[in-house]
Interface confidence: low
Amino acid sequence: KLTIESTPFNVAEGKEVLLLVHNLPQHLFGYSWYKGERVDGNRQIIGYVIGTQQATPGPAYSGREIIYPNASLLIQNIIQNDTGFYTLHVIKSDLVNEEATGQFRVYPELPKPSISSNNSKPVEDKDAVAFTCEPETQDATYLWWVNNQSLPVSPRLQLSNGNRTLTLFNVTRNDTASYKCETQNPVSARRSDSVILNVLYGPDAPTISPLNTSYRSGENLNLSCHAASNPPAQYSWFVNGTFQQSTQELFIPNITVNNSGSYTCQAHNSDTGLNRTTVTTITVYAEPPKPFITSNNSNPVEDEDAVALTCEPEIQNTTYLWWVNNQSLPVSPRLQLSNDNRTLTLLSVTRNDVGPYECGIQNELSVDHSDPVILNVLYGPDDPTISPSYTYYRPGVNLSLSCHAASNPPAQYSWLIDGNIQQHTQELFISNITEKNSGLYTCQANNSASGHSRTTVKTITVSAELPKPSISSNNSKPVEDKDAVAFTCEPEAQNTTYLWWVNGQSLPVSPRLQLSNGNRTLTLFNVTRNDARAYVCGIQNSVSANRSDPVTLDVLYGPDTPIISPPDSSYLSGANLNLSCHSASNPSPQYSWRINGIPQQHTQVLFIAKITPNNNGTYACFVSNLATGRNNSIVKSITVSASGTSPGLSA
């Protein structure tokens, strides 16, 4: 079938259109184009005879049409009047006619639109603004853009006049945006330049910054005022109702208490004619004095004296604060505060109470700290310690002993041998000692301030023969899989070798066994019941050797899971039930029984004579080791059958 396709269908003025013929028959005489939907000689555009290849213009020919051999018609420089239908009349060689009609539409190329406004300076919450997209164009669609986005849905936005007018009712400051309009038709789309809506608003209630309202005498007062406003607000300051200046900032240097009062910022918008004010109350405080601490006892004695620290000066209606070691006061029954917090009393001072102590006076703005105070607590002397710890020496060596006792002020030391004063020094030195130097060596420490003395006595043995050693232990009853045990071979002697034996054998290699302190100490980690053996230590030097008595390690363990015997679980009615419970444990455990959950007796053996089927049930043995704090249990089911029936059979 003969058809006409318009390319394009929508044509812009000034452009061209091709009426393209499809399914053109063969063996043609010629064809002719007409304006309109039918063949009308008065509206013929052009005719074409194939044989002569001659084109003949018709009455409707405008000079802008070109006909092609394939019957397609090109129309150039399209004008608005070209819109409509075009009919192709084909005359075949047998002079049979065939017709086809096509059409196209012509649209103007749109100009760049512009936006006109009925109000260039609308006032917020009062005015409406109507934007109109210019010029008015037929067959054009109008679109609007706000900040390059399509229009939001809002009851305050209204399109009218075929979308050509955009009205914003009751404008707000948020409507300050870039507005564009766009015109569209099938052949073009043009967007206007943006129009910025300048909404007059405010001033809002001004904000005064900074927010703090309390100042110290001598500081600078610098207040700044800001109110959201378009155009920007004009600012005025009033102090206690009296106008000061028309600036956004108010600066008063070196303020005094007299500058206290109400400070008002007024913001004025000359375009909206509105004023808004905000008031802040400023309080200026006099500078308080720096506090200091006085003490009723500058040299208190430990565990004897109390100390009262007082924060000076005394000021009415003032809050006093205290700090110890830069921390707030700890909760302690030895610390007492007076009702006004001004006095801090330390009851029965200790050497740890030295401080430093600080007090503070709190005013409305800040806290003023005193300088720190340190207490000189007199203490000691504690029991002196004599070093080194050796008690056995060989003849011919030098004996050098040193004494130390914690004390404030530092202790004065004296040495006595067998009760006789030797010298008033911290160290005692005797060269080339002999057996005659054996004896009781006493160190006496004296605190001259407190008048207290403490002594320590050490027995020194000078002998070529080593004494018989002994074993001391840090844990006489260790718990299995929990405790460690450290054996130490005594005494500590110079130039001596220490040896160890377990059950008469030298020490086995084990990660749980560790020698330290010159082999003088043997540590067993994570003891087990197998470690309950005889331990012996030996000492030797170049002259002699000696061995300790054995020490047997008593390892607490268990109770292990108990065993109930006999193992039988089926009994005949009338038999005696005699159950015995046993659990490996050191010390021996306490036993108790429960039948069907009900406590029975606290014995190792449970005996029930002449049992019946009523004695069926669960029999539980509970074991408890009070030394290890551990418990264990086992449950056994007992079945009693009536006489004459075997277990597992029914009559």
Epitope: K112, E134, P135
Partner: antibody, heavy 121, light 111 residues
Framework: QVQLVQSGAEVKKPGSSVKVSCKAS????????MHWVRQAPGQGLEWMGR????????KYVPKFQGRVTITADTSTSTAYMELSSLRSEDTAVYYC??????????????WGQGTLVTVSS | EIVLTQSPATLSLSPGERATLSCRAG??????????LHWYQQKPGQAPRLLIY???NRATGIPARFSGSGSGTDFTLTISSLEPEDFAVYYC?????????FGQGTKLEIK
Amino acid sequence: QVQLVQSGAEVKKPGSSVKVSCKASGFNIKDTYMHWVRQAPGQGLEWMGRIDPANGNSKYVPKFQGRVTITADTSTSTAYMELSSLRSEDTAVYYCAPFGYYVSDYAMAYWGQGTLVTVSS
Amino acid sequence: EIVLTQSPATLSLSPGERATLSCRAGESVDIFGVGFLHWYQQKPGQAPRLLIYRASNRATGIPARFSGSGSGTDFTLTISSLEPEDFAVYYCQQTNEDPYTFGQGTKLEIK
């Protein structure tokens, strides 16, 4: 209705300054621009510059830049044009005219009556 | 700046005749396809009076015999039938861009 009343005629010496006022009524001058145009005797119209009374922003023809100052007082709805360093060729009638969407649809629909400034030694 | 050239400088016609005044801009004064060109009439001793704004719109109170046309750079003021009070000087002005320039004027005088 829109009215523009200009100050009276002035005779000035060369080198001095003149300040012409233009009081507006019937509209808010903050909604418009105020323009100044002058016309020398027997000559055509010459645009001098304009001001936006809402913010005080002004714009001048380069020829007058540095000699002309246009101001506005929104509280009295009055615009001013001050021309300094006067010379004889500044003898002209000076007009004020509002310009903007509200009042004149982007043309000069209303004019002051004009102020004749004569510069003569 | 945009230079406006008016022609003719003087036009001598009789009442009742048709007057055509031309104003040519050195560059387009169109904004969004609308010519921002205006026509003013001035009589001796008077301030200018707006006749036509934006190329073709009659100002308030202007008789219908005054019409304007044109776009881009070429604009025409037409007075269809001259009345005695129409004899005056006519100026065109562009407000497309600063500075807002005027043409040098066309004097319409009685023949």
